[in-house]
């Protein structure tokens, strides 16, 4: 821990009425937990790469920024950060890479100022629906969370429960409508195959949404209409084939949006015509000149912005009798 334990403070005769003396000023006990480093002025506690198996009980009340990364926490129980007096100023909590596989209901209760939470790089096989809302009420007290970072929280295939991982995550995001104030949500690198239909409509304050490096094939059933504050939408490195008219119109209607679409396997056939037309006109797509076709083979690496309607054909579907094996 960081605070010094030695003590000495000389009191010289620089003051005319003060005799020269040595003051063995005893310092106050260090309030920094074992295996952690603390800065009172930065109001920061770092317990990093220490193989901790539980959250330290003796966290100082002044902490605003808490780093508990690179540990072996395994389970975050209810009230994991509940203290007396409470950690009333804790605003940013980073638990990334701490081998968490279970986050229980109410794990983040009694943190009235918690604005940023990072659970990235933990194999979350069991994320309680009430991890962020704290209660199973249909409408919970609003969470103070503004940023929720959940990148690479997908557990290995053999450790997943017998349920949809996407569904588990979304249940936690929507429970009790507690996250109505959430502005940044990062869900990158989670093998998401789809985005459940309701999720975005119930997060109306979102400014930044990162869904990059997933396996999203389509956005057909996803509505962006309510996200009037959305500023950035990261969809790079997914499995998107085409964006259809409804999605294009919704994105175009968002006043502040920037969309990132790099490294998707775009299928450049007749269904792509509307998207190509839109790309040529829109300002919302960042790096749109880098988007290239992946299929069909004859179109591979062609730049979407350089295509015209004649390039975008669909092979006729042959009647079964004419198909060859």
């Amino acid at each position: 821990s960081s605070s010094p334990t030695s003590s000495a403070s000389s009191f010289s005769s620089s003051a005319p009425f003060l005799a020269s003396a040595v003051s063995a000023q005893p310092p106050l006990p260090d309030q920094c937990p074992a295996l952690c480093e603390c800065s009172e002025a930065a109001r920061t506690v770092k317990c990093v790469n220490r193989n901790l198996t539980e959250v330290p009980t003796d966290l100082p009340a002044y902490v605003r920024n808490l780093f508990l990364t690179g540990n072996q926490l395994a389970v975050l129980p209810a009230g994991a950060f509940a203290r007396r007096p409470p950690l009333a100023e804790l605003a940013a909590l980073n638990l990334s890479g701490s081998r968490l596989d279970e986050v229980r209901a109410g794990a983040f209760e009694h943190l009235p100022s918690l604005r940023q939470l990072d659970l990235s790089h933990n194999p979350l096989a069991d994320l309680s629906p009430f991890a962020f809302s704290g209660s199973n009420a249909s409408v919970s007290a609003p969470s103070p969370l503004v940023e929720l970072i959940l990148n690479h929280i997908v557990p290995p295939e053999d450790e997943r429960q017998n349920r949809s991982f996407e569904g588990m995550v979304v249940a936690a995001l929507l429970a009790g409508r507690a996250l109505q104030g959430l502005r940044r949500l990062e869900l990158a690198s989670n093998h998401f195959l789809y985005l459940p239909r309701d999720v975005l409509a119930q997060l109306p304050s979102l400014r930044h949404l990162d869904l990059s490096n997933n396996s999203l094939v389509s956005l057909t059933y996803v509505s962006f209409r309510n996200l009037t504050h959305l500023e950035s939408l990261h969809l790079e490195d997914n499995a998107l084939k085409v964006l259809h008219n409804g999605t294009l119109a919704e994105l175009q209607g968002l006043p502040h949006i920037r969309v990132f679409l790099d490294n998707n396997p775009w299928v450049c056939d007749c269904h792509m015509a509307d998207m190509v037309t839109w790309l040529k006109e829109t300002e919302v797509v960042q790096g749109k000149d880098r988007l290239t076709c992946a299929y069909p083979e004859k179109m591979r690496n062609r730049v979407l912005l350089e295509l015209n309607s004649a390039d975008l054909d669909c092979d006729p579907i042959l009647p079964p009798s004419l198909q060859t094996s």
Epitope: P4, S6, S7, Q25, Q31, C38, S39, E40, A41, A61
Partner: antibody, heavy 119, light 108 residues
């Protein structure tokens, strides 16, 4: 060994200004708040203000706003206090003191700089 | 600001005697943010009792602190000659930090 070494005593005329220093050693300077405290002869202690060397934030006691100006030089782990428009009321011993916000108590004091204001 | 009033201003005790000095605040103070300092003549203050009742390292066990809310006290169970000093209370309930006027302890 934590030490707060302050500059020497000064005798100044009314209306003048004075800048005193407090060099910290034996700990990480930017990790702790630095306060300044006044003690007049035969009088109690008065808290002047506090400087957060990490963020640059300064909080003054309202009574000393416009009288005291706190600064730091992080590169030399030194805190400074300038007193302006001095009067006899400003005479006293001024100490830098490390404030522990774990407790909001002072754990180390400088030896004090005596300021005498006299015409 | 939260004004601290110490009493008595000066007290005199014989060696071995038990003494108690008090500090009253104009508004409530958290027990974790109330402290006592000892200042001997010609020296800087030393934190003596922190968070109402905890002795700083090196402080003899004859000292104790107690109190809550707006009323706090420092007690010496058996005064010794080396205890001659002025004792200041200090609180934080939001800035500014404030100190009491001090209690000067003398030995008869």
């Amino acid at each position: 060994e934590v030490q707060l070494q302050q500059s020497g005593p000064v005798l100044v005329k009314p209306g003048a200004s004075v800048k005193m220093s407090c060099e910290a050693s034996g700990y990480s300077f930017i990790d702790y708040y630095m306060s300044w405290v006044k003690q007049s002869r035969g009088r109690s202690l008065e808290w002047i203000g506090v400087f957060n060397p990490y963020s640059g934030e300064i909080i003054y006691n309202q009574k000393f706003k416009g009288k005291a100006t706190l600064t730091v030089d992080k590169s030399s782990s030194t805190a400074y206090m300038e007193l302006s428009s001095l009067t006899s009321e400003d005479s006293g011993v001024y100490s830098c003191a490390r404030l522990r916000i774990s407790y909001y108590a002072i754990d180390y004091w400088g030896q004090g700089t005596s300021v005498a204001v006299s015409s | 600001e939260n004004v601290l009033t110490q009493s008595p201003a000066i007290m005199s005790a014989s060696p071995g005697e038990k003494v108690t000095m008090t500090c009253r605040a104009t508004s409530s103070v958290s027990s974790g943010h109330f402290h006592w300092y000892q200042q001997k003549s010609g020296a800087s203050p030393k934190v003596w009792i922190y968070s109402t009742s905890n002795l700083a390292s090196g402080v003899p066990a004859r000292f104790s602190g107690s109190g809550s809310g707006t009323s706090f006290s420092l007690t010496i169970s058996s005064v010794e000659a080396e205890d001659v000093a002025t004792y200041f209370c200090q609180q934080y309930s939001g800035y500014p930090l404030t100190f009491g006027g001090g209690t000067k302890l003398e030995i008869k």
